[in-house]
């Protein structure tokens, strides 16, 4: 029975040209995490973190994806095309697969500064 839950950073926004941390956290389970996959909105894989092998960053993202913190992913040099859904898929034993969703909105610098200034605390 799958008892775990995935907590994510949810909906986030970041400046064009900046960087953002995509973070998922698996809780409420003792299952062993064997692999975490990070996918983009078009289902292309950005990176994999395998417990036996380490991190594999896919060639298309090697220049602007950095592992971590933890099992998260840092996406750098953001462009408007990076706007969209991101998915973390936790492969665990014995539970099976858990999946989390993050929506990233990349904003023009001036818009990002404006929206940040008026965020509700």
């Amino acid at each position: 029975m799958m008892t775990g839950t995935i907590e994510t950073t949810g909906n986030i926004s970041a400046k064009k040209g900046g960087s953002v941390i995509l973070q998922c956290h698996l809780s409420s389970t003792m299952a062993q995490v064997t692999q975490v996959n990070w996918e983009q909105h078009d289902h292309s894989l950005l990176a994999i973190r395998n417990a036996e092998l380490g991190w594999h960053i896919y060639p298309a993202f090697k220049d602007r994806v950095a592992p971590g913190p933890g099992l998260g992913l840092t996406l750098q040099s953001l462009t408007m095309n990076d706007t969209g859904e991101y998915f973390c898929t936790y492969h665990t034993y014995p539970d099976g697969t858990y999946r989390g969703r993050i929506f990233l909105e990349v904003l023009e610098s001036s818009v990002a500064e404006h929206s940040a200034r008026f965020q509700i605390p």
Partner: antibody
């Protein structure tokens, strides 16, 4: 005891193919990731490829990607490396190796099998 | 890919000496570093994994330290059987990569 024995090496012409085998014994082969590492004569170690316990999760060094294929037959406790389009720079002693689970160090190695690519 | 730079490439030492070998990674690799010993005509032997954990059966004169980009293998008192080539290997990123090796020779 835990043992890995490679075979299949030899002299081959550039552009040809060769298949290496690695027979495993003394441990639960079907639950272990397995690696190939090579060493050119008088040179250092170069990681070549890895395969997951169930035959998935295959990854390769850039130098062999698209030419080499790692595979395994868990019913025969055997690991394979199919090497196509061989080049002179593939000349090396090829080792299969078993990792320490979740520690990412290679604790059991075979004796190696020599591959010489020459016209 | 992560480059590992070992130094020195060779070192001459006597029995009883303390020998230190360093391995520098081109990017941070946390503590995912292993050390191997290789003697001529033999397969490598795992000494240290996780930067500092001693592999079972390896003498306690071998020790490893470091994290991030800078790592060290120390042989506290060199024994005759320790003359060999030593390699570091990172396992934070695929592809795994090895350092160029350090040959420990008899002075």
């Amino acid at each position: 005891q835990v043992q890995l024995v490679e075979s299949g090496g030899g002299v081959v012409q550039p552009g040809r193919s060769l298949r290496l085998s690695c027979a495993a014994s003394g441990f639960t082969f079907s639950s272990s990731y397995m690696h190939w590492v090579r060493q050119a004569p008088g040179k250092g170690l170069e990681w070549v490829a890895v395969i997951g316990a169930d035959g998935s999760n295959k990854y390769y060094a850039d130098s062999v990607e698209g030419r080499f294929t790692i595979s395994r037959d868990n019913s025969k406790n055997t690991l394979y490396l199919q090497m196509n389009s061989l080049r002179a720079e593939d000349t090396a002693l090829y080792y299969c190796a078993k990792p320490v689970p979740r520690r990412r160090g290679l604790d059991v190695w075979g004796q190696g099998t020599m591959v010489t690519v020459s016209s | 890919d992560i480059q590992l730079t070992q130094s020195p490439s060779s070192v001459s030492a006597s029995v009883g000496d303390r020998v230190t070998i360093t391995c520098r990674a081109s990017q941070g690799i946390s503590s995912w570093l292993a050390w191997y010993q290789q003697k001529p005509g033999k397969a490598p032997k795992l000494l240290i994994y996780g930067a500092s954990s001693l592999q079972s059966g390896v003498p306690s004169r071998f020790s490893g330290s470091g994290s991030g980009t800078d790592f060290t293998l120390t042989i506290s008192s060199l024994q005759p059987e320790d003359f060999a080539t030593y390699y570091c290997q990172q396992a934070f990123y695929l592809p795994w990569t090895f350092g160029g090796g350090t040959k420990v020779e008899i002075k």
